[in-house]
């Protein structure tokens, strides 16, 4: 946020940039949290825009019994590995086809034991405040589906009649990692020393990091004709004086008519 300065007073302004603002020859360049000619004002809204999507990664191991392990499968650039990857990916795409969050699989390692496939199942969902629940549910469905397929697609008399067959007991879920996104934490951090006064409110499922000085939210402070200003002790209303009235009170709701004061009378509305 920048405010431009013209005229002779600019040199003086340069040395007075506050709150870590820097002079660029024309104006104070303010850090994210501040604005104003001297960076003296605290912003009332901080952009903590969430990522468009949130990802999860499940580390799984399955044992493929319909393929015999050969040394070439250790080499990820070999034709054998590439063919295995292709078939395994096709098979897993079928297994997980009903899961909207499913993105694909990534083989990390193949090892002996028929073929033990260490791989990641990749999940992704659009960001909503309920993303954790959505991804938790998806990981449960992944577990159900892989358990089912590795129980059903098995070798009979050393022959597999499916694209791939599995060892029922060789299926394991090692780890589940969900990209963490905590808007409240981000809001607190970005608000720095004002963190106690900034809160997250949702509008159309999007989080907004705001102070009570930001209008239009449930926490917004109504300063009436005054101006809301953030200080280290919290939001405060700076009351205005008009041609006819002085305003006072915590929310500038007490108006005193000047003419009455001059006539030694107080009148509140």
């Amino acid at each position: 946020r920048t405010t431009t300065c013209f005229g002779d007073g600019c040199q003086n302004t340069a040395s007075r940039c506050k709150n870590g603002g820097t002079w660029d020859g024309l104006k104070c360049q303010c850090p994210n949290l501040y604005y104003g000619e001297l960076c003296e004002e605290v912003v009332s809204s901080i952009d903590i825009g969430p990522p468009e999507t949130i990802s999860a990664q499940m580390e799984l191991t399955v044992t493929v019994t319909s393929v015999k392990f050969t040394e070439e499968l250790k080499n990820h650039s070999s034709q054998e590995f590439q063919e295995f990857k292709q078939t395994f990916t096709e098979q897993m795409n079928i297994v997980y086809s009903g899961i909207p969050e499913y993105v694909g699989v990534n083989i990390t390692k193949l090892r002996l034991g028929s073929v033990v496939v260490e791989h990641d199942v990749l999940l992704r969902t659009k960001y909503t405040p309920e993303y954790k629940t959505v991804l938790d549910n998806a990981t449960e469905v992944v577990k159900e589906k892989i358990t089912k397929v590795t129980t059903q697609q098995i070798m009979i008399n050393d022959i597999c009649s499916d694209m791939m067959c599995f060892n029922t007991t060789g299926t394991q879920v090692q780890n589940i990692t969900v990209t963490q996104y905590d808007p409240e934490e981000d809001c607190r951090k970005m608000a720095k020393e004002y963190g106690d006064y900034f809160v997250v409110e949702y509008r159309d499922q999007k989080p907004y990091c705001i102070s009570p000085c930001e209008p239009g939210f449930s926490v917004s402070k109504n300063c009436n004709l005054g101006k809301c200003q953030m200080s280290l002790s919290g939001p405060q209303c700076l009351c205005v004086t008009t041609e006819t009235h002085w305003y006072s009170g915590e929310t500038c709701n007490q108006g005193t008519q000047k003419s009455l004061v001059y006539g030694h009378h107080h009148h509140h509305h």
């Epitope: 015999k68 054998e80 022959i159």
Partner: nanobody, 123 residues
Framework: DVQLVESGGGLVQPGGSLRLSCAAS????????MAWFRQAPGKEREGVAF???????SYAESVKGRFTISRDNAKNSLYLQMNSLRAEDTAVYYC?????????????????WGQGTMVTVSS
């Protein structure tokens, strides 16, 4: 590029014999798995027999004892000797291959395919 070309199909009387061949180019026939599949009109493609790089073979129940699969690594070729042929053996026969040591008769596991050769068993 892998190319598989089948030959040897034709018309034969019930009880007769045929030998199908599959010439593989760009495919190391000493590796992986080679197989024969067939598809009768209006039916799904089914596995007939496969042979692995170590010579291990497997056959569909319907052809056991009548058909023999073999491969000649020196000639990069696959063969299917078909004896005691029946009317129900009528189909297009396909040669298929995989670089992997497979133990499956599912067509989806085989990435390389020939164009097929027609076998008709009829009197």
């Amino acid at each position: 590029d892998v190319q598989l070309v089948e030959s040897g199909g034709g018309l034969v009387q019930p009880g007769g014999s045929l030998r199908l061949s599959c010439a593989a180019s760009g495919f190391p026939s000493s590796r992986g798995t080679m197989a024969w599949f067939r598809q009768a009109p209006g039916k799904e493609r089914e596995g007939v027999a496969f042979i692995n790089s170590d010579g291990r073979t497997s056959y569909a129940e319907s052809v056991k004892g009548r058909f023999t699969i073999s491969r000649d690594n020196a000639k990069n070729s696959l063969y299917l000797q078909m004896n005691s042929l029946r009317a129900e053996d009528t189909a297009v026969y396909y040669c298929a291959a995989s670089l992997l040591y497979l133990m499956t008769v599912n067509a989806a596991a085989y990435p390389y395919w020939g164009q097929g050769t027609m076998v008709t068993v009829s009197s």
